[in-house]
Interface confidence: medium
C-alpha cells in the first residue's frame, strides 16, 4: 500500500441491507476512510458502541469513519447505523497491523473488499508519516532548555525506532537527567540540555521489509549572564477607586538571584528629586524571589494618598533594572471608567 | 484552611427581594475581598459586585440599581441583597474570595441555587 | 465593557491530546485574566491567574499564556479528569467580565 493512499470500503453508496462482518487489518500510521452510505445521507459510525464526533483525530462525518493515522487503541469493533434507524449498514472490526502474520507482496491491496476474508496489507518499508514535523533540522537551544525530536514513521509490519548520537547508539546513561524514549510517539526528548549534549542525533527507524533514517543537529547556546530582565508593561498603569484593593505586577526574569524592591516616589519640601539628582522614594517591600515568578505589590484599602507613582527596581550580580507605572486613586464609589491596562513608562 | 459558604432560601417570589449570607473561615474579611459571581441554568458565568477589604464595594452597572453587598466582620460573613427579582434572576449564586497577592476569584464557595418562581 | 469571548464553544478529544482554547478580549486588559475550570454539578476552580501563574496544586500539564487582548490555556496532555468547562475571566476593568466557556469533553 503506498504511503499516501488511503483505506477505503467499496461501494461508497448505499450498501446491501445484508451486510456480512468485516474484518480489516490496518498498519499503524495507516490513514483511514470507511464510507456508508451516500454522502448526504451517510449514516452515523459507532465505536464500541459509543457514536463518534464529527471532529477530532477519530471522526465519523457525512457517513465516513476517518482516521488520520491508526493508533493502537483505534482497534475495535465499529458500526454504522443508518440515519433514524438501528438498521446495521456496515459492521467490521479493526485490527492493528503489528498483529499480522506476513502476507504476499503481489497481493492484491483491493482484496480486502471481499467480505468473506480476513484482510492484510502487503509488507512495506518504513516511511515518515509526517515528514513536514521533520523540516527543522538543525535545533539551536539556550542550556536548561528543554529538546525533543521526532521522527514518526509506518509500515508494515510496525517498525522500531532506535537513535543514534554522533552515529553511536545512544541510550542516554550517560547524561546527567538521562533521556525519555516514547516509542509511541517516535521521540526523544532531553530535559535541561548542556554544552555536551552538542551533536548529531539519528533516529534509525527499520522493520523486515528495509529502514530510513534522519539526522538532526543540536547545537546549545550557553547563556551570558544579564542583569534582570522585565517583562514589557508591568507594572501598568493602573485606575482604582478609594477603598478598593490594587494589585501592581512585576515579572521578573533572571538567571542570577534576583534581589526585588517596590518604591513609591514621594515628595519632600516640594521637590520629587533630591540634590544629588535621585528621586525620593519610600521602600514599601523587598523581597528575593525564583527566577520567572511574579511579583507584586498588594495595596488593600486604597486612599488619595496612594496615587503616585510605583517602581519596581529588580538587581543581580550584574546589574539592576527597573520600571515604573501610576496609580490613579478616583473618589466614586462606583466606577464607571474602563482602567484599559495602558504601557508602563519605562525608566530602564 | 481558606472555606466560603452560600446560605439562603431556595425560592424567592417574582417581584420580591433576594437575601443572601457567605459565611468564610480560614481567613479574615479584613485582608481579602470577596466577590458575589451567578450562574443561570446552563449558561456561563456573571460577576455581580465585590466588597473590598476596607468595607467599600462596587458593583457591575447592569445589577448596580437592585444589588446592596455589605458584611459583619465579627462573624466573619458578606451578605448579599438583590430586589426586584424576574424569573431570569434564577441561578445558582456563588461568593468567592480574591488571591491576596496572587489575582481574582481564587477560593469558591459550593454555590446556593435560587428559583425565582410563582 | 470587555468582552472575553472564548473559542471553540466545545470540543471533542481524547486521552493523550493536546488541547488549546483561546479566549480574546474586546479590548487591552494586560494580563489581569485568569482561567477557571467548571466539572459538572460544582463550583469553578482556578486554574490560571495573571493569564500564566499556575494556581498551586494544579498540574503542570495545564499552560495560560498570552497578554493583551489574546490569551490561550494549554492542556498539554488530555486526562480522563479534564472534561469540563473553561472560562476565562478579565479582572482589569468594571464590569469584571467572564467568557462563554469552552467546553470539553471526551470522544
Known amino acids: 500500500l503506498e504511503a499516501s493512499e488511503e483505506v477505503e470500503l467499496e461501494p461508497c453508496l448505499a450498501p446491501s441491507l445484508e451486510q456480512q462482518e468485516q474484518e480489516l487489518t490496518v498498519a499503524l500510521g495507516q490513514p483511514v476512510r470507511l464510507c456508508c452510505g451516500r454522502a448526504e445521507r451517510g449514516g452515523h459510525w459507532y465505536k464500541e458502541g459509543s457514536r463518534l464526533a464529527p471532529a477530532g483525530r477519530v471522526r465519523g462525518w457525512r457517513g465516513r469513519l476517518e482516521i488520520a493515522s491508526f493508533l493502537p487503541e483505534d482497534a475495535g469493533r465499529y458500526l454504522c447505523l443508518a440515519r433514524g434507524s438501528m438498521i446495521v449498514l456496515q459492521n467490521l472490526t479493526l485490527i492493528t497491523g503489528d498483529s499480522l502474520t506476513s502476507s504476499n507482496d503481489d497481493e492484491d491491496p483491493k482484496s480486502h473488499r471481499d467480505p468473506s476474508n480476513r484482510h492484510s496489507y502487503p509488507q512495506q518499508a518504513p516511511y515518515w508519516t509526517h515528514p513536514q514535523r521533520m523540516e527543522k533540522k538543525l535545533h539551536a537551544v539556550p542550556a536548561g532548555n528543554t529538546v525533543k525530536f521526532r521522527c514518526p514513521a509506518a509500515g508494515n509490519p510496525t517498525p522500531t525506532i532506535r537513535w543514534l548520537k554522533d552515529g553511536q547508539a545512544f541510550h542516554g546513561e550517560n547524561r546527567i537527567g538521562g533521556i525519555r524514549l516514547r516509542h509511541q510517539h517516535w521521540s526523544l526528548v532531553m530535559e535541561s540540555v548542556v554544552p555536551s549534549d552538542r551533536g548529531t542525533y539519528t533516529c534509525l527507524v527499520e522493520n523486515a521489509v528495509g529502514s530510513i533514517r534522519y539526522n538532526y543537529l543540536l547545537d546549545v547556546l550557553e547563556r551570558s549572564p544579564h542583569r534582570p530582565i522585565l517583562q514589557a508593561g508591568l507594572p501598568a498603569n493602573t485606575t482604582a477607586v478609594v477603598g478598593s484593593d490594587v494589585e501592581l505586577l512585576c515579572k521578573v526574569y533572571s538567571d542570577a538571584q534576583p534581589h526585588i524592591q517596590w518604591l513609591k516616589h514621594i515628595v519632600i519640601n516640594g521637590s520629587s528629586f533630591g540634590a544629588d539628582g535621585f528621586p525620593y522614594v519610600q521602600v514599601l517591600k523587598t523581597a528575593d524571589i525564583n527566577s520567572s515568578e511574579v511579583e507584586v505589590l498588594y495595596l488593600r484599602n486604597v486612599s488619595a494618598e496612594d496615587a503616585g507613582e510605583y517602581t519596581c527596581l529588580a538587581g543581580n550580580s550584574i546589574g539592576l533594572s527597573y520600571q515604573s507605572a501610576w496609580l490613579t486613586v478616583l473618589p466614586e464609589e462606583d466606577p464607571t471608567w474602563t482602567a484599559a491596562a495602558p504601557e508602563a513608562r519605562y525608566t530602564d | 484552611q481558606v472555606q466560603l459558604r452560600e446560605s439562603g432560601p431556595g425560592l424567592v417570589q417574582p417581584s420580591q427581594t433576594l437575601s443572601l449570607t457567605c459565611t468564610v473561615s480560614?481567613?479574615?474579611?479584613?485582608?481579602?475581598?470577596v466577590s458575589w459571581v451567578r450562574q443561570p441554568p446552563g449558561k456561563g458565568l456573571e460577576w455581580m459586585g465585590v466588597?473590598?477589604?476596607?468595607?467599600?464595594?462596587t458593583y457591575n452597572s447592569l445589577l448596580k440599581s437592585r444589588l446592596t453587598i455589605s458584611r459583619d466582620t465579627s462573624k466573619s460573613q458578606v451578605f448579599l441583597k438583590m430586589n426586584s427579582l424576574q424569573t431570569e434572576d434564577t441561578a445558582t449564586y456563588y461568593c468567592a474570595r480574591g488571591g491576596g497577592d496572587r489575582g481574582y476569584f481564587a477560593f469558591w464557595g459550593p454555590g446556593t441555587m435560587v428559583t425565582v418562581s410563582s | 465593557n470587555t468582552v472575553m469571548t472564548q473559542s471553540p464553544t466545545s470540543m471533542f478529544t481524547s486521552v493523550g491530546d493536546r488541547v488549546t482554547m483561546s479566549c480574546k478580549a474586546s479590548?487591552?486588559?494586560?494580563?489581569?485574566v485568569g482561567w477557571y475550570q467548571q466539572k459538572t454539578g460544582q463550583s469553578p476552580k482556578r486554574l490560571i491567574y495573571?493569564?500564566?501563574n499556575r494556581d498551586t496544586g494544579v498540574p503542570d500539564r495545564f499552560t495560560g499564556s498570552g497578554s493583551g487582548t489574546d490569551f490561550t490555556l494549554t492542556i498539554s496532555n488530555m486526562q480522563a479528569e479534564d472534561p469540563a468547562i473553561y472560562y476565562c475571566?478579565?479582572?482589569?476593568?468594571?464590569?469584571?467580565?467572564f467568557g462563554g466557556g469552552t467546553k470539553l469533553e471526551l470522544k
Open positions: 475571566l478579565q479582572h482589569n476593568s468594571y464590569p469584571w467580565t
Open positions: 495573571w493569564a500564566s
Open positions: 480560614g481567613f479574615s474579611l479584613t485582608f481579602y475581598h
Open positions: 466588597i473590598w477589604t476596607g468595607g467599600s464595594t
Open positions: 479590548q487591552n486588559v494586560g494580563i489581569n
